[in-house]
């Protein structure tokens, strides 16, 4: 998988998107890593 | 609403350095990697490098062979690109750029820095 | 580093016709591309993100599509504020890299 931070970045808003949101405060791009998907 | 400030126009001497900053507004500053792109005139776009502003860590554009130093004032919510040895073909307009998913999911750019090099 | 070659350089159309641009990775980066929309003296502006998906606020009549190596702008109908410099972008490696741009202009 891609693990650029524009990727990252993409990644984590799909995964926002369909959870409705409802994730932990701390769940932003720069504090997950790749390992999170 | 979301914003990237830049700092102003420069002009500066074959071998001189030159940092530029940019100020972050209307985001969580530390959520969000900030990259640097430039585009010289008539050149296509060109990726300077990337910062993650929570914990410092960069990746540069080896094109730059170390010439490059992207830091954060987490406290200003401010990144800087620093070019340094810099050359006439380092002239150019020289860009901050973020890409958000809150409050919108967007891609937002700074307004753009002319650094022009000329002896 | 990946090439992107984008084509045509330049082209003239007519308001209301329908206009592709291409870009050519030269090697596979997957969906990872972006394209981004560039008037005289200003910004870009982000259009595209993974190859097909308009961020909000994009008119529908921008569309991107492809995957792997071959990727393409289509604007269904051109609109006179549609005139711009258009540039493609890959981010699934480091460095991130451009086409060298399409020049759009009306006839």
């Known amino acids: 998988a891609c693990d650029t931070a524009t990727c990252v970045t993409h990644r984590l808003a799909g995964l926002l998107s369909r959870s409705g949101g409802v994730v932990k405060n701390n769940f932003v791009p720069t504090n997950v890593g790749s390992k999170a998907f | 609403e979301v914003q990237l400030v830049q700092s102003g126009a420069e002009v500066k001497k074959p071998g001189a350095s030159v940092k530029v900053s940019c100020k972050a507004s209307?985001?969580?500053?530390?959520?969000?990697?900030m990259n640097w792109v430039r585009q010289a005139p008539g050149q296509r776009l060109e990726w300077m490098g990337v910062?993650?502003?929570?914990?410092?860590?960069?990746t540069y554009n080896r094109k730059f062979k170390g010439r490059v130093t992207i830091t954060v004032d987490k406290s200003a919510s401010t990144a800087y690109m620093e070019l340094s040895s810099l050359r006439s073909e380092d002239t150019a307009v020289y860009y901050c750029?973020?890409?958000?998913?809150?409050?919108?999911?967007?891609?937002?750019w700074g307004q753009g820095t002319t650094v022009t090099v000329s002896s | 580093d990946i090439q992107m070659t984008q084509s045509p350089s330049s082209l003239s159309a007519s308001v209301g016709d329908r206009v592709t641009i291409t870009c050519k990775a030269s090697?596979?980066?997957?969906?990872?591309v972006a394209w981004y929309q560039q008037k005289p003296g200003k910004s870009p502006k982000a259009l595209i993100y993974?190859?097909?998906y308009r961020y909000s606020g994009v008119p529908s009549r921008f569309s991107g599509s492809g995957s792997g190596t071959d990727f393409t702008l289509t604007i269904s109908s051109l609109q006179p504020e549609d005139v711009a410099t258009y540039h493609c972008?890959?981010?699934?490696?480091?460095?991130?890299?451009f086409g060298q741009g399409t020049k759009l202009e009306i006839k």
């Open positions: 209307g985001y969580t500053f530390t959520d969000y990697y």
């Open positions: 750029a973020s890409l958000l998913i809150r409050p919108h999911y967007f891609d937002y």
């Open positions: 910062i993650n502003p929570y914990q410092g860590r960069t």
């Open positions: 993974s190859a097909s």
């Open positions: 972008q890959q981010y699934n490696f480091y460095p991130y890299t």
């Open positions: 090697q596979n980066v997957g969906t990872n």
